[in-house]
């Protein structure tokens, strides 16, 4: 059997694992001492519950869901995490001035439960 990828949230709209955007300043992120730009980042992250087989990434996530129902104190529910990322370029301080650096795992692009 393969992992099912249910997209219906039984908890109600917006309650299950999804992409969420938070606007954050360099100060909010603790980056002000090494990043110069951008001064504000639209941080995309994965937030929400992972009930039943909702967006199960693989068979392991399905097993985790089943065992969590049986032994909630021992087995945690699957977690909502990025399935892929959007890259981002930062202008950052260096010993000699400034430079560009590309980060390929900074912003979530889409989410699943694992």
């Amino acid at each position: 059997a393969r992992a099912r990828n249910g997209d219906h949230c039984p908890l109600g709209p917006g309650r299950c694992c999804r992409l969420h955007t938070v606007r954050a300043s360099l100060e909010d992120l603790g980056w002000a001492d090494w990043v110069l730009s951008p001064r504000e980042v639209q941080v995309t992250m994965c937030i929400g519950a992972c009930p039943s087989q909702f967006r199960a990434a693989n068979m392991h996530a399905q097993i985790k869901t089943s065992l969590h129902r049986l032994k909630p104190d021992t087995v945690p529910a699957p977690c909502c995490v990025p399935a892929s990322y959007n890259p981002m370029v930062l202008i950052q301080k260096t010993d000699t001035g400034v430079s560009l650096r590309t980060y390929d795992d900074l912003l979530a692009k889409d989410c699943h439960c694992i």
């Epitope: 001064r39 981002m88 400034v98 650096r101 390929d104």
Partner: antibody
Framework: EVQLVQSGAEVKKPGESLKISCKGS????????IGWVRQMPGKGLEWMGV????????IYSPSFQGQVTISADKSISTAYLQWSSLKASDTAMYYC????????????WGQGTLVTVSS | QSVLTQPPSVSGAPGQRVTISCSGS????????VNWYQQLPGTAPKLLIY???NRPSGVPDRFSGSKSGTSASLAITGLQAEDEADYYC??????????FGGGTKLTVLG
């Protein structure tokens, strides 16, 4: 509507100086980086450098470091590309382009400024 | 010589499917993303595909991008006369310089 409007074509002699401009409108000018791209006649695109108009931080491609200067005046939403001493090999079309939200691609482009350097 | 390698030209008849390749290395396409630009004759480049496979609004779904390993491809289906243009791929190299492919001239036959 996002627009980048560049200054008109220029014909210069070797050794002369030049400053071309790129005026942004329809968006918050200080919230997006501006890049400059060169296209020599019949050739491809070459990235020259980038400026953050909000903080005036500039970074140049090693190929163009020391050859040109990129600047911006945020009070009039305009970025600039300048040469102190032009060479015949600077003859090209120069484009300004706005970086997308993540700084990884160019989502809007100016119409280009043709610079011709000839004695 | 460009860091990213594209074929100088490709051609196809109206209605056909054509692909344009963009070959890089483990220091650019291999670990990062690819964007594609279309430059119609006498005009400025225009963003066609970003982050490998995303289309900006207004770009027809006849255009699609993909990436595998250190190569990327742009596919155009249902080729139209107005698709005749130069196409450029773009990524970054290991020192975070923005790099372009040499460009591919697409000719629509007929």
């Amino acid at each position: 509507e996002v627009q980048l409007v560049q200054s008109g074509a220029e014909v210069k002699k070797p050794g002369e100086s030049l400053k071309i401009s790129c005026k942004g409108s329809g968006y918050s000018f200080t919230s997006y980086w501006i890049g400059w791209v060169r296209q020599m006649p019949g050739k491809g695109l070459e990235w020259m450098g980038v400026i953050d108009p909000g903080g005036s931080y500039t970074i140049y491609s090693p190929s163009f470091q020391g050859q040109v200067t990129i600047s911006a005046d945020k009070s009039i939403s305009t970025a600039y590309l300048q040469w102190s001493s032009l060479k015949a090999s600077d003859t090209a079309m120069y484009y300004c382009a706005r970086y997308g939200r993540y700084g990884t691609y160019f989502d809007y482009w100016g119409q280009g400024t043709l610079v011709t350097v000839s004695s | 010589q460009s860091v990213l390698t594209q074929p100088p030209s490709v051609s196809g008849a109206p209605g056909q499917r054509v692909t344009i390749s963009c070959s890089g290395s483990s220091s650019n396409i291999g670990v990062l993303y690819v964007n594609w630009y279309q430059q119609l004759p006498g005009t400025a480049p225009k963003l066609l595909i970003y982050s490998n496979d995303n289309r900006p609004s207004g770009v027809p779904d006849r255009f699609s991008g993909s990436k595998s390993g250190t190569s990327a491809s742009l596919a155009i289906t249902g080729l139209q006369a107005e698709d005749e243009a130069d196409y450029y791929c773009q990524s970054w190299d290991s020192s975070s310089n923005y790099v372009f492919g040499g460009g591919t001239k697409l000719t629509v036959l007929g």
